[in-house]
Amino acid sequence: QGGAAEGVQIQIIYFNLETVQVTWNASKYSRTNLTFHYRFNGDEAYDQCTNYLLQEGHTSGCLLDAEQRDDILYFSIRNGTHPVFTASRWMVYYLKPSSPKHVRFSWHQDAVTVTCSDLSYGDLLYEVQYRSPFDTEWQSKQENTCNVTIEGLDAEKCYSFWVRVKAMEDVYGPDTYPSDWSEVTCWQRGEIRDACAETPTPPKPKLSK
């Protein structure tokens, strides 16, 4: 998606099938207010962006309302009347689901079921990562619905958990983004804890799968 034209790099993120963010990095035009023009239908006239993102006082992106649109975004980034980047992109290929909400934990002996609110669209994976201070890496389990049971836990150990949502690659393609992680929650003997002793700070989530 970041193909360059006249030195312009673009990034598209479709937040939760609600808002499309298109940002650009144009070293040649770093002190210029480039304008963003778009349409959702190949036959319509272009509209100009009304919600620009600014960086160091200059336009660097545009936010568009695009609630659950199964559309191609046609857009043109211009310097005055001169187009410096023109493209069309199928928006859903750059989907970033929202972070899981209402995450709950239900313990039964050596197993925990993690649930959260399913998003309003499908073909997603809900991933739970967990670790104890004795684990060198995060363990992971994922399901198509936000109802993930992890078995074989040690009731005496403290475990840290966090959850995220990913778009299925076979359905949405390879260019989507995972959601941000939910907050880390720590549990021991079926009870919530402030922290798990000796647990290293969780790594920042990567934007790759």
Epitope: D70, G122, D123, N144, M168, D170, V171, Y172, G173
Partner: antibody, heavy 119, light 107 residues
Framework: QVQLVESGGGVVQPGRSLRLSCAAS????????IHWVRQAPGKGLEWVAI????????NCDQKFKDRFTISRDNSKNTLYLQMNSLRAEDTAVYYC????????????WGQGTLVTVSS | DIQMTQSPSSLSASVGDRVTITCKAS??????IAWYQQKPGKAPKLLIY???YRYSGVPSRFSGSGSGTDFTLTISSLQPEDFATYYC?????????FGQGTKVEIK
């Protein structure tokens, strides 16, 4: 609007070959997975193969792998199904279908082309 | 291969009836299930994807549910145009497989 038009069907003798075509229009051909699905007369649907036109990756049901080959020509926005060593049980309507988004469920279907294998 | 078993294979119903069709997968397919409607001589039409999400333009009387191995397509109030054959299909793993179909006929 999205359109898929199959062609190339007809009557063919057992053991012979046939190449089906699926001409796509109304969308960016290289953005989607496209499939062949067949349906024998009075029977149910049977998935045959998939191709991702962007990279040419294919997957074919094992039972057709030795005889059927799925391919595409991006410059012509056309998908093909090469069928060799045809048998009477290959008699069916052959549909090409496009996924809803990049992959997944099949949202757009052609009208189908009938292949009859008979001596 | 994952087997998809639909039941019943056919049913008779009247306009206004609530109709339920079930589909059972031979192994866990998560929610990677689609439902299609097909009328004689026509290509199938997508109704439901990801087990429970209605495809755009599909009337709200059609709904899907289930995950794992057991799935249901429900038509809440059968309309004259709903008499057709319905297929479930899994897209969890290749080869993709369809159920054998359920024919909904007029009583």
């Amino acid at each position: 609007q999205v359109q898929l038009v199959e062609s190339g069907g007809g009557v063919v003798q057992p053991g012979r070959s046939l190449r089906l075509s699926c001409a796509a229009s109304g969308f960016t051909f290289t953005d989607y997975a496209i499939h062949w699905v067949r349906q024998a007369p009075g029977k149910g649907l049977e998935w045959v193969a998939i191709i991702r036109p962007s990279n040419g990756n294919t997957n074919c049901d094992q039972k057709f792998k030795d005889r059927f080959t799925i391919s595409r020509d991006n410059s012509k926005n056309t998908l093909y199904l090469q069928m060799n060593s045809l048998r009477a049980e290959d008699t069916a309507v052959y549909y090409c279908a496009r996924s809803r988004v990049w992959g997944g469920s099949l949202a757009y279907w052609g009208q189908g082309t009938l292949v009859t294998v008979s001596s | 291969d994952i087997q998809m078993t639909q039941s019943p294979s056919s049913l008779s119903a009247s306009v206004g009836d609530r109709v339920t069709i079930t589909c059972k997968a031979s192994q866990n397919v998560g929610t990677n299930i689609a439902w299609y409607q097909q009328k004689p001589g026509k290509a199938p039409k997508l109704l439901i994807y990801s087990a429970s999400y209605r495809y755009s333009g599909v009337p709200s009387r059609f709904s899907g549910s289930g995950s794992g191995t057991d799935f249901t397509l429900t038509i809440s109030s059968l309309q004259p145009e709903d008499f057709a054959t319905y297929y479930c299909q899994q897209y969890k793993s290749y080869p993709w497989t369809f159920g054998q179909g359920t024919k909904v006929e007029i009583k």
